[in-house]
């Protein structure tokens, strides 16, 4: 002991109280109040515990420290005072944080910010979905651009060259961000170009699954050109690739009159206001693609007549001639707005094809590709007519949007009776 | 800075199994595809194998399909070439190499842009 | 499988010369072709992709060229960097293939 009368030997964590007791510090605790043993110990009082009086309020986490406590905001929660830590109830000022107006967030560039209380999240853009394995709504999720997500090979078929197109396209959907939709379209088309410039192994397949992956093709091109589009500025756009694939579009924001895209081999005229959607924000796209590889694999399809259209070309013509399909005279084109509601259009669609001779005495449809429930597809006429045609032009009007083409029907034009010319 | 580096080449007797490593780093194998090449000594690039990140479909030659195996683990950012029934004609330098897009105003296409060092696999009893 | 036929297997040339090198596809392979440049004990470097496009950081004497199914990396002026052997690559369809390489070596 020392001359003060105070004991030398009191434990970590304590004070004397004389010469032969010690007594715990603020904040620790022994089995009892007074210490008369060095053997005695002081222990830290936790004060977060259940138990205990401490109450730091709403928002907030009792954090225990040696010996005392603190008060602190939970996470995704601040104090409107300023200070990081307090001691009660009273003293807690601590209120949500948005992260997203902030920028305290973490968020993906392909998910949108999300405030939640206390916390946040991230979703996927309009249009995006999670990738592969990762959910949606998480701090960490990840999204990728629907638009290439359905555009996969169809199924059932097994061609080399058509895997390796949608690997490449796949590629580029992973990497894809609004800014290089320009890019990206041209990227696609290009693909596109060199696949049916080099179609490989789908020249080997069957000719209904030649047909399969054209509507296949077709019916995708037109979902992703639509979906990136909309990225692009305002503006008239053309391009064109080594094999013959061409693209023409027109960006624009609110107008309201006719717009023409003119191609090498077609020419397309329509309404503006067709091509939005009502209540769509978005920008109006119109556009149109000549895909003449396409022909290719379309080489045999099927021609389906509605039946009155079939008897009107019987009443004028001998019938269809025994040597099969018919035949395809212009480049396939395919069109499309920012509105995909395109089946039944308010005002007509008018087509220019340029094309290949005809035959004389034979028979010169306006057609569409119809998409099968089956995945593939036919040659139609419903809502297209033949407006005329000379040897190496026609022009037809439509009252819907799809893949067109003109096509030469193997009917035999019946001779002109002289007396029915001269009654007319 | 982009680079690939393989490892898990060696000796192996006919009919014995390796497995190929190749560590990406400067940039992610789950937002990239991979392919292996493999040069026999004194010859030419063989192309081995692909597997597409996006799509998660793989592509072999004619020549290993069925033995071979590719695959990526993201977590650890490496792609991997499971060899098995190894055959005395695998012997070869394996490469790993990064399938690139390539896309601006004026030109747009593919290419194997990065390669590892190459890692040697010899079969022979 | 689509053979890409790789002519000559080798050439003897001098500094300063122009180096025409040809791969010949077996089908149409559109523009889907990249040429590579490999030296010994070396992993292959990209030169060409696309038939024609030049890759970053290749030196503009280097430029790919396409006539139909037959495709030519030309060397304008050959530098001594630039002995090596020179491969073509089709990338239209899976199995993707290589030519055989054409070793440019100095006379």
């Known amino acids: 002991q020392d001359s003060r009368g105070c004991a030398r030997w009191c434990p970590q964590d304590s004070s004397c109280v004389n010469a032969t007791a010690c007594r715990c510090n603020p904040g620790f605790s022994s089995f009892s109040e007074i210490i008369t043993t060095p053997m005695e110990t002081c222990d830290d009082i936790n004060e977060c515990a259940t138990l205990s009086k401490v109450s730091c309020g709403k928002f907030s986490d009792c954090w225990n420290t040696e010996g005392s406590y603190d008060c602190v905001c939970s996470p995704g929660y601040e104090p409107v005072s300023g200070a990081k830590t307090f001691k009660n109830e009273s003293e807690n000022t601590c209120q949500d944080v948005d992260e997203c107006s902030s920028g305290q967030h973490q968020c993906d560039s392909s998910t949108v910010c999300f405030n939640t209380v206390g916390s946040y999240s991230c979703r996927c853009r309009p249009g995006w979905k999670p990738r592969h394995g990762i959910p949606n709504n998480q701090k960490d999720t990840v999204c990728e651009d629907m638009t290439f997500s359905t555009w996969t090979p169809p199924p059932g078929v097994h061609s080399q060259t058509l895997s390796r197109f949608f690997d490449k396209v796949q590629d580029l959907g992973r990497d894809y961000k609004p800014g290089l939709a320009n890019n990206t379209i041209q990227s696609i088309l290009q693909a596109l170009d060199e696949l049916l410039e080099a179609p490989g192994d789908l020249e080997t397949l069957p000719r209904l699954q030649q047909h399969c992956v054209a509507s296949h093709l077709l019916d995708g091109l037109e979902d992703v050109l639509r979906g990136l589009s909309k990225n692009l500025s305002n503006g008239l756009l053309n391009f064109s690739y080594p094999a013959g694939t061409e693209l023409s579009l027109e960006v624009q924001k609110q107008v309201d009159r006719s717009v023409t895209l003119r191609q090498n081999q077609a020419v397309m005229q329509l309404d503006w206001n067709q091509a939005q959607k009502s209540g769509d924000p978005g920008p109006s796209v119109v556009g149109l693609v000549s895909i003449p590889g396409m022909g290719k694999l379309l080489a045999e399809a099927p021609l389906v007549l509605e039946p009155e259209k079939q008897m009107l070309l019987h009443e004028t013509h001998q019938g269809l001639l025994q040597d099969g399909s018919p035949i395809l005279l212009s480049d396939v084109i395919s069109a499309f707005l920012s509105n995909n509601d395109t089946q039944n259009l308010s005002s007509p669609v008018t087509f220019t094809f340029s094309h290949r001779s005809v035959i004389p005495r034979q028979k010169v449809l306006c057609v569409f590709w119809e998409h099968g429930q089956n995945g593939c597809g036919h040659w139609a006429t419903t809502g297209c007519s033949t407006i005329g045609t000379r040897d190496t032009s026609t022009i037809c009007r439509c009252t819907h949007l799809s893949s067109f083409a003109v096509l030469m029907a193997h009917y035999d034009v019946q001779e002109e009776d002289p007396v029915l010319t001269v009654i007319t | 800075e982009v680079q690939l580096v393989e490892s898990g080449g060696g000796l192996v007797q006919p009919g014995g199994s390796l497995r190929l490593s190749c560590a990406a780093s400067?940039?992610?194998?789950?937002?990239?595809?991979i392919h292996w090449v493999r040069q026999a000594p004194g010859k030419g690039l063989e192309w081995v194998a692909y597997?597409?990140?996006?799509?998660?479909?793989?592509y072999y030659a004619d020549s290993v399909k069925g033995r071979f195996t590719i695959s990526a683990d993201t977590s650890k950012n490496t792609a991997y070439l499971q060899m098995n029934s190894l055959r005395a004609e695998d012997t070869a330098v394996y490469y790993c190499?990064?399938?690139?897009?390539?896309?601006?105003?004026?030109?747009f296409g593919w290419g194997l842009d990065y390669w590892g060092q190459g890692t040697l696999v010899t079969v022979s009893s | 499988d689509i053979q890409m036929t790789q002519s000559p297997s080798s050439l003897s040339a001098s500094v300063g010369d122009r180096v025409t090198i040809t791969c010949r596809a077996s089908?149409?392979?559109?523009?889907?072709v990249a040429w590579y440049q490999q030296k010994p004990g070396k992993a292959p470097k990209l030169l060409i992709y696309?038939?024609?496009s030049l890759y970053s950081g290749v030196p503009s004497r280097f430029s790919g060229s396409r006539s139909g199914t037959d495709f030519t990396l030309t060397i304008s002026s050959l530098q001594p960097e630039d002995f090596a052997t020179y491969y073509c690559?089709?990338?239209?369809?899976?199995?993707?293939?290589f030519g055989q390489g054409t070793k440019v070596e100095i006379k």
């Open positions: 400067g940039f992610t194998v789950s937002s990239s595809s």
């Open positions: 690559q089709q990338d239209s369809s899976y199995p993707i293939t």
């Open positions: 696309s038939a024609s």
């Open positions: 597997i597409s990140s996006s799509s998660g479909s793989t």
């Open positions: 190499a990064r399938d690139f897009y390539f896309g601006s105003y004026y030109s």
């Open positions: 089908q149409s392979v559109s523009s889907a």
